[in-house]
C-alpha cells in the first residue's frame, strides 16, 4: 500500500481542516488508514482522524482543531496499521479556505433598489471575522448570458444595486462567496443561492 498523491490540507480557520490524498489502488480508507496530527508546541496531544473514502482510491479526513491562530503548525503522520506511509506538516494559516457565507436574503421592498444581505460565517472573536471580503454572483434563470459578479470590498455583508440594472419581469438568482486577503486565502464555496422576481417601475418618459 502506497500513497500516490500526498495529502493536501485546507483550513476553515475556525474548527476544521480537511486533508485529501490518493492511494495507489482502491482502499477502504476508514478501516485501513489513520491520519495522526499534533501541534508542534510543548505538551500538545496527538489526535487521530479516521478518513473517509473520496472515490475509489481517494481519502478525505476532517481534522478537528480548536481556536486556530497563525502560529499553529501541525505534524501529520499517515499510518496503515503499523506502517508509516507518509509524514508531513501543515500550517493552517497558510492554507485557508474560508467558510461559505450564509443566510443570503434579497430585500426587494426598498424603492427600486435591491438590498442583498448575508451572514459572516465567523464569530466576532475569530480573526477572519473582520478580514473577509465577498463576491456576489447574480444571474438570470432565463438568459445564461445575463451573469454578473459584484465585488464587495468593504466589511459589511451587504450589497445595494439598482433594480433597473437587471431586467424587469424575470427571475434572478444570487449567491455569495468570501475570501480574506490577509491570509491570501482561496475563495470559499458559494453560499446556497436565493431566487427572486425582479420588477421595478419604469420611469415616465419626459417629452
Amino acid at each position: 500500500m502506497k500513497v500516490l498523491q500526498e495529502p493536501t490540507c485546507v483550513s476553515d480557520y475556525m474548527s476544521i481542516s480537511t486533508c485529501e490524498w490518493k492511494m495507489n489502488g482502491p482502499t477502504n480508507c476508514s478501516t485501513e488508514l489513520r491520519l495522526l496530527y499534533q501541534l508542534v508546541f510543548l505538551l500538545s496531544e496527538a489526535h487521530t482522524c479516521i478518513p473517509e473514502n473520496n472515490g475509489g482510491a481517494g481519502c478525505v479526513c476532517h481534522l478537528l482543531m480548536d481556536d486556530v491562530v497563525s502560529a499553529d503548525n501541525y505534524t501529520l503522520d499517515l499510518w496503515a496499521g503499523q506502517q508509516l506511509l507518509w509524514k508531513g506538516s501543515f500550517k493552517p494559516s497558510e492554507h485557508v479556505k474560508p467558510r461559505a457565507p450564509g443566510n443570503l436574503t434579497v430585500h426587494t421592498n426598498v424603492s427600486d433598489t435591491l438590498l442583498l444581505t448575508w451572514s459572516n460565517p465567523y464569530p466576532p472573536d475569530n480573526y477572519l471575522y473582520n478580514h473577509l471580503t465577498y463576491a456576489v454572483n447574480i444571474w438570470s434563470e432565463n438568459d445564461p448570458a445575463d451573469f454578473r459578479i459584484y465585488n464587495v470590498t468593504y466589511l459589511e455583508p451587504s450589497l445595494r444595486i439598482a433594480a433597473s440594472t437587471l431586467k424587469s419581469g424575470i427571475s434572478y438568482r444570487a449567491r455569495v462567496r468570501a475570501w480574506a486577503q490577509c491570509y491570501n486565502t482561496t475563495w470559499s464555496e458559494w453560499s446556497p443561492s436565493t431566487k427572486w422576481h425582479n420588477s421595478y417601475r419604469e420611469p415616465f418618459e419626459q417629452h
Epitope: 505538551l43 480548536d66 497563525s70
Partner: antibody
C-alpha cells in the same frame, strides 16, 4: 470572575523543601493546561513547569528538573508545585498561570504570585 | 535556547505618543510570540498572542506584528494607565523564553 490564588511561599534554607498551591476558580480548571512561572529579582521571567489538563504530561525547565514536581487535583481545582533541594537561585515570586490553549503557549490568567526566599 | 532580545530596555514617552517596542528572536519562531504587560507590584497580563492577535478585553490601541525573528509591539496613543513593563515571550522553541522587558514611563 477568574481567580488563581497561590499559597505556600516563604523563607526556606538551602536544601529545604516547599509546596506551593494554587486554588483556581471562575473557569473550567479540569480542561485547562496550567503552569508555574517565576520572576527573580533582576532576572527574566522563566517558565518553571507546565502540566496538561489530566496531569498525564508535564514539562520542566532544565534548571528545576529532578528537583521540582508539578501536579494537579482536578477534583479540588488545585495546582501544586513541590519544590525540593532548593537553592539560592530559586528565590523568586512564583506565579500560577493558565495556558490559553491545549499546549504551552500564551498564558491568559495569572495569579497574584507567592514569594519564595531561599537563604540561610 | 532561543534568545529574545527586547529593545529598548526602558523608554519615556508623553501621553498621546505612539510607542514602539521591538523583540528579536535568535532564530525563527514563526508567529509564536506573546506580549505581556506588568504594572508595578502586579502580575503580568496577556495583551497580544500569536504575534498579532489582540486578547479579549484589551484596548485596541495595543497591537502586535511580525513573524520569523522580528516582532513589534505598538501602543498607538499612550495613556497614563499604560505605565508598566512589557515583555515578549516565544513558545515556538523549547524551552519557551522571555524577553528582558521594556520599562515604559510617562514624560
Amino acid at each position: 470572575e477568574v481567580q488563581l490564588v497561590e499559597s505556600g511561599g516563604g523563607l526556606v534554607q538551602p536544601g529545604g523543601s516547599l509546596r506551593l498551591s494554587c486554588a483556581a476558580s471562575g473557569f473550567t480548571f479540569s480542561s485547562s493546561y496550567m503552569s508555574w512561572v517565576r520572576q527573580a529579582p533582576g532576572k527574566r521571567l522563566e517558565l518553571v513547569a507546565a502540566i496538561n489538563s489530566n496531569g498525564g504530561k508535564t514539562y520542566y525547565a532544565d534548571s528545576v528538573k529532578g528537583r521540582f514536581t508539578i501536579s494537579r487535583d482536578n477534583s479540588k481545582n488545585t495546582l501544586y508545585l513541590q519544590m525540593s533541594s532548593l537553592r539560592a537561585e530559586d528565590t523568586a515570586v512564583y506565579y500560577c498561570t493558565r495556558q490559553r490553549g491545549n499546549y504551552v503557549g500564551a498564558m491568559d490568567y495569572w495569579g497574584q504570585g507567592t514569594s519564595v526566599t531561599v537563604s540561610s | 535556547d532561543i534568545q529574545m532580545t527586547q529593545s529598548p530596555s526602558s523608554l519615556s514617552a508623553s501621553v498621546g505618543d505612539r510607542v514602539t517596542i521591538t523583540c528579536q528572536a535568535s532564530q525563527d519562531v514563526s508567529t509564536a510570540v506573546v506580549w505581556y504587560q506588568q504594572k508595578p507590584g502586579k502580575s503580568p497580563k496577556l495583551l497580544i498572542y500569536s504575534a498579532s492577535y489582540l486578547y479579549t478585553g484589551v484596548p485596541s490601541r495595543f497591537s502586535g506584528s511580525g513573524s520569523g525573528t522580528d516582532f513589534t509591539f505598538t501602543i498607538s496613543s499612550l495613556q497614563p494607565e499604560d505605565i508598566a513593563t512589557y515583555y515578549c515571550h516565544q513558545y515556538y522553541g523549547s524551552p519557551p523564553t522571555f524577553g528582558g522587558g521594556t520599562k515604559l514611563e510617562i514624560k
